[in-house]
Amino acid sequence: MAVTACQGLGFVVSLIGIAGIIAATCMDQWSTQDLYNNPVTAVFNYQGLWRSCVRESSGFTECRGYFTLLGLPAMLQAVRALMIVGIVLGAIGLLVSIFALKCIRIGSMEDSAKANMTLTSGIMFIVSGLCAIAGVSVFANMLVTNFWMSTANMYTGMGGMVQTVQTRYTFGAALFVGWVAGGLTLIGGVMMCIACRGLAPEETNYKAVSYHASGHSVAYKPGGFKASTGFGSNTKNKKIYDGGARTEDEVQSYPSKHDYV
């Protein structure tokens, strides 16, 4: 039961995280005009990965897309790439994890296959979360650098007569959404990896049956088991296939009277 809960929770947390990463990537408020210690402007500027917007005190908002690829800063391109890679990996991870869920039965899929899929999706979620966190952090670092640069020459005077107010930008809501979403995706991925360990069928204790032929002392290893070292061996024999029914979260299956001929 604990494995199913861990896997299910990991899936839900990752789903929320990836939805958040998508939302953050689409949001316009990656950087917002710094209002602190600034003259009160009747215009509010904010920028996203794909367009920049201006909201006037009149209520009108105008957004303009970045219609150039080559003219954009390399850092912005890198952030875009990281966020898109994060979304793509996350989406594939979600798709894989749906089929890996214990509560969903697809044909006669083996637990080992589900375990592998769970681990794969878990790793994908971890990488996806890391991509989002990295992307947001790179953008935040870019903002901090630009903020202090513009603070250094906030007012550029023309002969000391006319002043031009330089617009400074600070962290927008999208950064916080991105950090939280990336963290959730990462946590979800870790949970999926933990669930994978529980899903993987563990080696079980089996006693190998020994048949003595005349003049020989050969230990017969029944099919369906890995070779044992001999009669009465306590070595764990990993079962390759078990046709019998088992409970949802059964980690070990013990031999029954039907296991041996």
Epitope: Q33, P39, V40, T41, A42, V43, N45, Y46, Q47, S52, C53, V54, E56, S57, S58, G59, F60, E62, R64, V162, Q163, T164, V165, Q166, T167
Partner: antibody
């Protein structure tokens, strides 16, 4: 079509109070009060976001004038306290538009502060 | 507060003349976010409410004749009437629409010569 109709102007004694109203019909996101003293130029008084009620005032009017709105009546107000002779002017309400320009204006209401 | 200085304070012109009014602000009204200058021009006739002519320094308000045009960026702006008509004799105001408090120029009165 947006229509703005001011009312509430009149004669008031120095130190007195007056409340101006501006009936608004049509869509408005933010509104302003602008005044014009006889034979003088235009002077911006205050701005308000009609949705949040967030106000902004010109320095000369902070503390004395209060801009507000009543959503149910779709009316803009300007409460004027501690009135002085120099507050004598025609008061206009105006709607903020694109570029923060004032595209619609009321007909104006005259406020006379005199003893 | 932003100071708006208009010149001339008054001018006499004839119908058909080209008229230019200048406006200077104490700080740049150019917004880096959209590269637009938040300067507005109004026309006011005696006893009437002002009328919006131009916003964003150069964008003509709908219904305003094309003989009116605005130009400028940063701190220096110009209103031009290419061919003065009888109905254009009025007072013209420029306005800072970028910083609170919004401030108006002292006005330029265009009179008949």
């Amino acid at each position: 079509e947006v229509q703005l109709v001011e009312s509430g102007g009149g004669l008031v004694q120095p130190g007195g109070s007056l409340r101006l109203s501006c009936a608004v019909s049509g869509y408005t996101f933010s509104m302003n009060w602008v005044r014009q003293a006889p034979g003088k130029g235009l002077e911006w008084v205050a701005w308000i976001n009609m949705y949040t009620g967030e106000p902004t005032y010109a320095d000369d009017f902070k503390g004395r004038f209060t801009i507000s709105r009543d959503d149910s009546k779709n009316t803009l107000y300007l409460q004027m306290n501690s009135l002085r002779a120099e507050d004598t002017a025609v008061y206009y309400c105006a709607r903020s538009s694109r570029g923060n320009g004032f595209d619609y204006w009321g007909q104006g209401t005259l406020v006379t502060v005199s003893s | 507060d932003i100071q708006m200085t208009q010149s001339p304070s008054s001018l006499s012109a004839s119908v058909g003349d080209r008229v230019t009014i200048t406006c200077k602000s104490s700080q740049s009204l150019l917004n880096s976010g959209n590269q637009k200058s938040y300067l507005t021009w109004y026309q006011q006739k005696p006893g009437k409410a002002p009328k919006l002519l131009i916003y964003w320094a150069s964008t003509l308000e709908s219904g305003v004749p094309s003989r009116f045009s605005g130009s400028g960026s940063g701190t220096d702006y110009t209103l031009t009437i290419s061919s003065l008509q009888p109905e254009d004799f009025a007072t013209y105001y420029c306005q800072n629409a970028y910083f609170f408090p919004f401030t108006f120029g002292q006005g330029t009165k265009v009179e008949i010569k």
